[in-house]
């Protein structure tokens, strides 16, 4: 019960994380204009990994692509190769966990390959969620560098009497939504590993019998644990010291009210 | 067509306060900010403040800060400008204007003004 | 504040002749995010409220006529009339569209001789 919890819930988190980072590679506000110097601007300009936007005044918002490819940063190069590929990591990583969840069942899938489907989305989640915050940290990082630099240039101009301010930007919502989706998707990826050792068969030194006394019907069940003889034919991971509660696994036929060790 | 008619010419004494109105017509209200300028007799112009009915939002110039407060009756499509203490140095001719929105961002249309003259 | 100063103050020419006339701002309009220059030029006729003539310092307002022209970028901006007429008889305003407050320019006032 706890293991297909944490599955589910694994998950789940992974999910919201996996839209998350997805919604913050779409998103315009990657970096925003700094106000500090200038806080009523009629002009604020902010910036995404795709295009950069200048909202007037007006409510008039105008956004221009960045058409070139070889034009901009390695920087900015490599934070979008990031997030591309903790987004594709990621939905591969939701394909397999799908498969993977205890409370789905796709023909006889053994709980082993249940497992290992498990541990797979897992390490995918994981390296999802550390690929977008590292993306999300390295534009970060450029943006600190390139804001302490435009300070130090803030004014420039013959003789100080004309000012050019530079334009400075700072964090936008959308790195902040990359770190949070980026965090819950390494979560959801751990969590997964976790479920996955719940998941596992595990080997034991003796053949598991199970008794179901129901009055008519006696139910003989060898490899109760997949034994390490490699007697029984039952892999399923079964618990026969419940006392009578079943996993969704253990729902069987018989008319019994009680099981025995 | 875009017109911006504004209520007429005003005489009040040092000390009170005048509203006057920007009725707008023509085009759809809260799409615009309508702006408002002061022009001293034969002088520049200086900007008020300006308010968007879109989201209610207003600015004001610091200097106007106090002076000047900018409402709006939707309803009517009017904007109202209020100024309050006035002394002599608020006589002016009051402009609205509507801001451009989109590649057009300035102000493309202006009311007639608003005459205002404070005197004892 | 952003402050605008245009010269010259006035100026008078005969009709026909090229009239250049000058605004320079103590900080660049020029906007980074889209290369747009946020400055305005009016023209006000005694007696009327101003008339937008440009914007963008070099797109012209439909309906104005093509004997208008403005150009400069960041803080040097040129309105020229290439053939003046009588009826441009008026104070020609330069304004920063830029940042709050909006502010004028002390304007340049066209005389016709």
């Known amino acids: 019960m706890a293991v297909t919890a944490c599955q589910g819930l694994g998950f789940v988190v992974s999910l919201i994380g996996i839209a998350g980072i997805i919604a913050a590679t779409c998103m315009d506000q990657w970096s925003t204009q700094d106000l500090y110097n200038n806080p009523v601007t009629a002009v604020f300009n902010y910036q995404g990994l795709w295009r950069s936007c200048v909202r007037e005044s007006s409510g008039f918002t105008e956004c221009r692509g960045y058409f070139t490819l070889l034009g901009l940063p390695a920087m900015l190069q490599a934070v979008r190769a990031l997030m591309i590929v903790g987004i594709v990591l990621g939905a591969i990583g939701l394909l397999v966990s799908i498969f993977a969840l205890k409370c789905i069942r796709i023909g006889s899938m053994e709980d082993s390959a249940k497992a290992n489907m498990t541990l797979t989305s897992g390490i995918m989640f994981i390296v999802s969620g550390l690929c977008a915050i590292a993306g999300v940290s390295v534009f970060a990082n450029m943006l600190v560098t390139n804001f302490w630099m435009s300070t130090a240039n803030m004014y420039t101009g013959m003789g100080g009497m004309v000012q050019t301010v530079q334009t400075r930007y700072t964090f936008g919502a959308a790195l902040f939504v990359g770190w949070v989706a980026g965090g819950l998707t390494l979560i959801g990826g751990v969590m997964m590993c976790i479920a996955c050792r719940g998941l596992a068969p595990e080997e034991t030194n003796y053949k598991a019998v199970s008794y179901h006394a129901s009055g008519h019907s006696v139910a003989y069940k060898p490899g109760g644990f997949k034994a390490s003889t490699g007697f029984g034919s039952n892999t399923k991971n079964k618990k026969i010291y419940d006392g009578g509660a079943r996993t969704e696994d253990e729902v069987q036929s018989y008319p019994s009210k009680h099981d025995y060790v | 067509q875009v017109q911006l008619q504004q209520s007429g010419a005003e005489l009040v004494k040092p000390g009170a306060s005048v509203k006057m109105s920007c009725k707008a017509s023509?085009?759809?209200?809260?799409?615009?900010?309508i702006e408002w300028m002061k022009q001293n007799h034969g002088k520049s112009l200086e900007w008020i403040g300006n308010f968007h009915p879109y989201n209610d939002d207003t600015k004001y110039n610091e200097k106007f800060k106090g002076k000047a407060t900018l409402t709006v009756e939707k309803s009517s499509s009017t904007v109202y400008l209020e100024l309050s203490r006035l002394t002599s140095d608020d006589s002016a001719v009051y402009y609205c204007?509507?801001?451009?929105?989109?590649?057009?961002?300035?102000?493309?249309?202006w009311g007639q003004g608003t005459s205002v003259t404070v005197s004892s | 504040d952003i402050v605008m100063t245009q010269s010259p103050s006035s100026l008078s020419v005969s009709a026909g002749e090229k009239v250049t006339m000058s605004c320079k701002s103590s900080q660049s309009l020029l906007n980074s995010g889209n290369q747009k220059n946020y400055l305005a030029w009016y023209q006000q006729k005694p007696g009327q409220p101003p008339k937008l003539l440009i914007y963008?310092?070099?797109t012209r307002e439909s309906g104005v006529p093509d004997r208008f022209t403005g150009s400069g970028s960041g803080t040097d901006f040129t309105l020229t009339i290439s053939s003046v007429q009588a009826e441009d008889l008026a104070v020609y305003y330069c304004q920063n569209d830029h940042s709050y407050p909006y502010t004028f320019g002390g304007g340049t006032k066209l005389e016709i001789k």
């Open positions: 204007a509507r801001r451009g929105y989109g590649s057009s961002y300035a102000m493309d249309y």
């Open positions: 023509g085009y759809t209200f809260t799409t615009y900010p």
């Open positions: 963008g310092a070099s």
